[in-house]
Interface confidence: low
């Protein structure tokens, strides 16, 4: 009969530097055998070979050898193929040429995405602001892709589209920096808020400044940090935003700045007698110090760790002392859940399998969600695990048992509740007697 | 920009039948499920049929399953509401309305059509 | 299917009021709650969904809390134009997706 290469309707969607599959299945008749396959991935666009296997033998990766099949699992039809450590210039579409007694092909599309920063915001004039003045706000948020969709909003939530310029740089790797300028006339007070969308992984990175413009009492320091937590990834650095309002003929000879630990009072970094006192964090903190004359007293955390994550008091003492706290909160994405199906062959209707959704070093802990070919969520025998490793990232596997119909597709959506990335993966069995084509 | 326009609706004799369209635009119709909610006057919302991008799976609230049967024609951007055996409480405004993704709500409607179902 | 039930059914308030509207759930449904509002004659619009997340463009004095069955919409602060009548709907499991009976937020 006609040779049917069955891949996913749907992009697979692969975050820079994780692992991804491409899934390819066909249908082997009875007496297939290995020696007769001729499979062959190669772009589409330029039909560059990627990974081959012919003469009954693996042909190797012709693609900076990042590619790999599922040698087990070719006899049962499973022509998938694992490329590691995507990289942005692998976005495209991949096709799956199999080729036995018939011949049958099928394209499938990668789309690369990574999760844009918590956008950090600038303010120019940055100090002795009234109302009427008009100032400089800038929005920057780094190493995402595709390229971003950037939205301002006042604290009313009514959106800003006047005076907005936007640009987008992308780096050597492929992956942009987003930096949005919002040019606003000061009211008496005001928010400012900017969110950066990654329009693939819906990941939405907020900021906000809010300015008052009136000078405040003298001698009084106001110290101001962001409401909500600065959210950082795992291994990259992050700025615990902290600000005072210098008086006239302030000197940093004269101020004090401590930040510690907000629960244990341990301390992380301070400056006193005019100049700064260094890391007491394991000298991963730094202070921005052309700017604390500014009245810039924001903390520069770097390659941030599970353990950092909690409250950090900023303590401004001048003549009058001001503290306040901000959190943060440390996330890392997901990978892309992997599926095992137990067992995994000669399977009927009627028959219960254990399906394994695995997804790895994220943080904090997940959310599973499964559910059927037509979205109906499955929540009966399902049993998630979550283990945190040395670093305090967690591996989740959930396995859910069911009875299978005729055929079915089972979805697995892990989420990431704080980058609210959703990482899916699904495995549809069908046939009667059934076999195992996995669909990552 | 994502617009759905319902037309198709009218005056209807008890145990008559009306055919209700949905022209969607602004976004890649055959991506998402769609939905029927109506509202009685001066009633609250009730979802009366969903349907998923292809057409493959649908679903009737109780007080509508049997007599009521939601379709699409992705290639024509189109959702319809075919209604038979229709009851004077049938009567309401009917809204089209787009599935977002999961836990996302209903973010785009219709204007809405009034069906009126008197003698 | 799953009953919401919003309370109260109606309200009174005045500008500047803080407004807290009610709704319960049959069953658990995992945050999976959306909170709309409706002007007269004209088509709902959502405000909350995923029980938590400002829908992109609504101000930010509307919030919304819950887990598991009983779910909160809050306005911090009534403006004018708040005064309408605001459902909420689950999204567990098959549609149907019920929605609650409304609450009606009339000028005190």
């Known amino acids: 009969g006609a040779l049917e290469v069955q891949v996913p309707e749907d992009p697979v969607v692969a975050l820079v530097g994780t692992d991804a599959t491409l899934c390819c299945s066909f249908s082997p008749e009875p007496g297939f055998s290995l020696a007769q396959l001729n499979l062959i991935w190669q772009l589409t666009d330029t039909k560059q070979l990627v990974h081959s296997f012919a003469e009954g033998q693996d042909q190797g990766s012709a693609y900076a050898n990042r590619t790999a099949l599922f040698p087990d699992l070719l006899a049962q039809g499973n022509a998938s193929l694992r490329l590691q450590r995507v990289r942005v210039a692998d976005e495209g579409s991949f096709t799956c040429f199999v080729s036995i007694r018939d011949f049958g092909s099928a394209a499938v599309s990668l789309q690369v995405a990574a999760p844009y920063s918590k956008p950090s915001m600038t303010l120019e004039p940055n100090k002795d602001l009234r109302p009427g003045d008009t100032v400089t706000i800038t929005c920057s948020s780094y190493q995402g892709y595709p390229e971003a969709e950037v939205f301002w909003q006042d604290g009313q939530g009514v959106p800003l589209t006047g005076n907005v310029t936007t640009s987008q740089m992308a780096n050597e790797q492929g992956l942009f920096d987003v930096h949005s300028i919002l040019r606003v006339v000061l009211g008496a007070n005001g928010t400012y808020s900017c969110l950066v969308r990654n329009p693939v992984l819906q990941q939405d990175a907020h900021s906000s400044v809010t300015i008052t413009p009136q000078r405040s009492p003298t001698g009084a320091v106001e110290v101001q940090v962001p409401e909500d937590p600065v959210v950082a990834l795992v291994g990259t650095d992050a700025t615990l935003r902290c600000s005072f309002s210098p008086e006239p003929g302030f000197s940093l000879a004269q101020l004090n700045l401590i930040w510690q630990l907000t629960d244990t009072k341990q301390l992380v970094h301070s400056f006193t007698e005019g100049r700064d006192q260094g890391s007491a964090y394991a000298n991963r903190t730094a202070l921005f110090p052309d700017l604390l004359a500014q009245g810039n007293a924001s903390l520069r955390l770097q390659r941030v760790r599970v353990a950092d994550e909690g409250s950090f008091t900023c303590f401004v003492s001048i003549r009058d002392f001001g503290s306040a706290a901000v959190s943060l909160q440390v996330a890392a994405p997901y990978s892309k859940p992997s599926m095992t199906l137990e067992p995994n062959k000669d399977l009927r209707p009627g028959d219960t399998v254990t399906i394994t959704c695995s997804s790895y070093r994220g943080y904090p802990e997940a959310e599973v969600f499964w559910q059927d070919g037509q979205g109906v969520p499955l929540t009966g025998n399902v049993t998630t695990s979550q283990m945190a490793n040395e670093q305090g990232l967690f591996d989740v596997h959930s396995v859910l048992r069911v009875v299978l119909g005729a055929n079915g597709t089972y979805s697995c959506l892990v989420r990431n509740p704080v980058l609210q990335q959703d990482a899916h993966g699904s495995v549809t069995i069908t046939g009667q007697p059934m076999t195992f084509p996995p669909e990552a | 920009e994502v617009q759905l326009v319902e037309s198709g609706g009218g005056l209807v004799q008890p145990g008559g039948s009306l055919r209700l369209s949905c022209a969607a635009s602004?976004?890649?119709?055959?991506?998402?499920?769609m939905s029927w909610v109506r509202q009685a006057p001066g009633k609250g919302l009730e979802l009366v049929a969903a349907?998923?991008?292809?057409?493959?799976?649908?679903y009737y609230a109780d007080s509508v399953k049997g007599r009521f049967t939601i379709s699409r024609d992705n290639a024509k951007n189109t959702l319809y509401l075919q209604m038979s055996s229709l009851r004077a409480e049938d009567t309401a405004v009917y809204y089209c309305?787009?599935?977002?993704?999961?836990?996302?709500?209903?973010?785009?409607w219709g204007q809405g059509t009034l069906v009126t179902v008197s003698s | 299917d799953i009953q919401m039930t919003q309370s109260p059914s109606s309200l009174s308030a005045s500008v500047g009021d803080r407004v807290t509207i009610t709704c319960r759930a049959s069953?658990?449904?995992?945050?999976?709650l959306a909170w709309y509002q409706q002007k007269p004659g004209k088509a709902p619009k959502l405000l909350i969904y995923?029980?938590?997340n400002l829908q992109s463009g609504v101000p930010s004095r509307f919030s919304g809390s819950g887990s598991g069955t009983d779910y909160t919409l809050t306005i911090s602060s009534l403006q004018p134009e708040d005064f309408a009548t605001y459902y909420c709907?689950?999204?567990?499991?098959?549609?149907?997706?019920?929605f609650g009976q409304g609450t009606k937020l009339e000028i005190k």
């Open positions: 995923a029980a938590s």
């Open positions: 309305t787009r599935n977002e993704e999961f836990r996302r709500g209903l973010a785009y």
């Open positions: 602004g976004f890649t119709f055959s991506s998402y499920g």
């Open positions: 349907i998923n991008s292809n057409g493959g799976s649908t």
């Open positions: 069953e658990n449904i995992y945050s999976n």
């Open positions: 709907q689950h999204f567990w499991g098959t549609p149907p997706w019920t």
